[in-house]
C-alpha cells in the first residue's frame, strides 16, 4: 500500500526549486522569492539563510540551494555550516571569556583559533629537547641524551647547515 501511495503521490513529481502546493490542489509551485528547495517532492520551500553582521555571504541563495556564510576578517567559523563566528586571536594566544590571552608558560598555540596546548614532553619518548618551545611553537625533540654522549653511536653526524647567502670559505 505504501508503495502504491507513493507512486500516486503528485508531490513526488515536484522538482527541486518547487514545492507541492496544498493551497492549489497539490500542483508544483515554484519557490517564492528568497526561499529554496534543494530536493524534489518538498511540501514547503525553506527560507534562505541571511548572512548578516559578522557573517558574510560566501554563496548566494538560489531557488534550489541555500546561501552559505563565512565570517568577516578577524573571525573564523565554528559549527556545522558556519553556524557561529568566533573572534580570531594571535598565534601564542587563546580566546577566553575575557578576550585573547597569552598562552601560559609551557603551552603554545600556532593558530589564530583554538586553545593553548602543552609542549611535547620529549622525555616521555626518551628524547631530549633540541629546540625550546615558545608561546607560538611546540618544542622540537631531538635524539635521546644517550645518543648524544661521546662514542655512543658510530653514525657520522650531519654536516652543519650553511646559512643562506654565504659561500663556502
Amino acid at each position: 500500500f505504501e508503495r502504491t501511495r507513493s507512486l500516486q503521490d503528485p508531490c513526488s513529481n515536484c522538482p527541486a526549486g518547487t514545492f507541492c502546493d496544498n493551497n492549489r490542489n497539490q500542483i508544483c509551485s515554484p519557490c517564492p522569492p528568497n526561499s529554496f528547495s534543494s530536493a524534489g517532492g518538498q511540501r514547503t520551500c525553506d527560507i534562505c539563510r541571511q548572512c548578516k553582521g559578522v557573517f558574510r555571504t560566501r554563496k548566494e541563495c538560489s531557488s534550489t540551494s541555500n546561501a552559505e556564510c563565512d565570517c568577516t576578517p578577524g573571525f573564523h567559523c565554528l559549527g556545522a555550516g558556519c553556524s557561529m563566528c568566533e573572534q580570531d586571536c594571535k598565534q601564542g594566544q587563546e580566546l577566553t571569556k575575557k578576550g585573547c590571552k597569552d598562552c601560559c608558560f609551557g603551552t603554545f598555540n600556532d593558530q589564530k583559533r583554538g586553545i593553548c596546548r602543552p609542549w611535547t614532553n620529549c622525555s616521555l619518548d626518551g628524547k631530549s629537547v633540541l629546540v625550546n618551545g615558545t608561546k607560538e611553537r611546540d618544542v622540537v625533540c631531538g635524539p635521546s641524551p644517550a645518543d648524544l654522549s661521546p662514542g655512543a653511536s658510530s653514525v657520522t653526524p650531519p654536516a652543519p647547515a650553511r646559512e643562506p647567502g654565504h659561500s663556502p670559505q
Epitope: 526549486g17 515554484p30 519557490c31 517564492p32 522569492p33 528568497n34 548566494e60 541563495c61 538560489s62 531557488s63 534550489t64
Partner: nanobody, 111 residues
C-alpha cells in the same frame, strides 16, 4: 493585482514549433516568479517551465532540451519556445505568477 494574457497557441504538426507569449500588466515585482503550466481535460495542472526569483530558468524533465523560457522585462512579457512538438504536448497552456493566472492558450499537435 497582476493580469496575465497568453497568446501564440494553435495547431501545429508533430515536430513543429510554437512560441507562446505571456503579457503581464499591473504591479509586478522585479523578483516575481513566472511559470508555464499545462492542463488536459479532466487532468491536474502540471508545471512545464518557470523562471525562478533568482532569474534562472528551470524545466521539468519532459520539457528539457525542447522548450525554452525567457522574459523581456521591458515588455513585461515571458515567452515559452516549444520545439520538436509531440502529440502528447497537446494541452491548454497557462501562464502563472503568484496568485494570478492567464486564461490559457490551446496547443494542438497533429500527426
Amino acid at each position: 493585482a497582476v493580469q496575465l494574457v497568453e497568446s501564440g497557441g494553435g495547431l501545429v504538426q508533430s515536430g513543429g514549433s510554437l512560441r507562446l507569449s505571456c503579457a503581464a500588466s499591473g504591479n509586478i515585482s522585479s523578483l516575481h516568479v513566472i511559470a508555464w503550466y499545462r492542463q488536459g481535460p479532466g487532468k491536474q495542472r502540471e508545471l512545464v517551465a518557470w523562471i525562478a526569483w533568482d532569474d534562472i530558468a528551470h524545466y521539468v524533465d519532459s520539457a528539457k532540451g525542447r522548450f525554452a523560457i525567457w522574459r523581456d522585462n521591458t515588455k513585461k512579457t515571458t515567452y515559452l519556445q516549444m520545439n520538436s512538438l509531440k502529440l502528447e504536448d497537446t494541452d491548454v497552456y497557462y501562464c502563472n505568477s503568484g496568485d494570478s493566472w492567464g486564461q490559457g492558450t490551446q496547443v494542438t499537435v497533429s500527426s
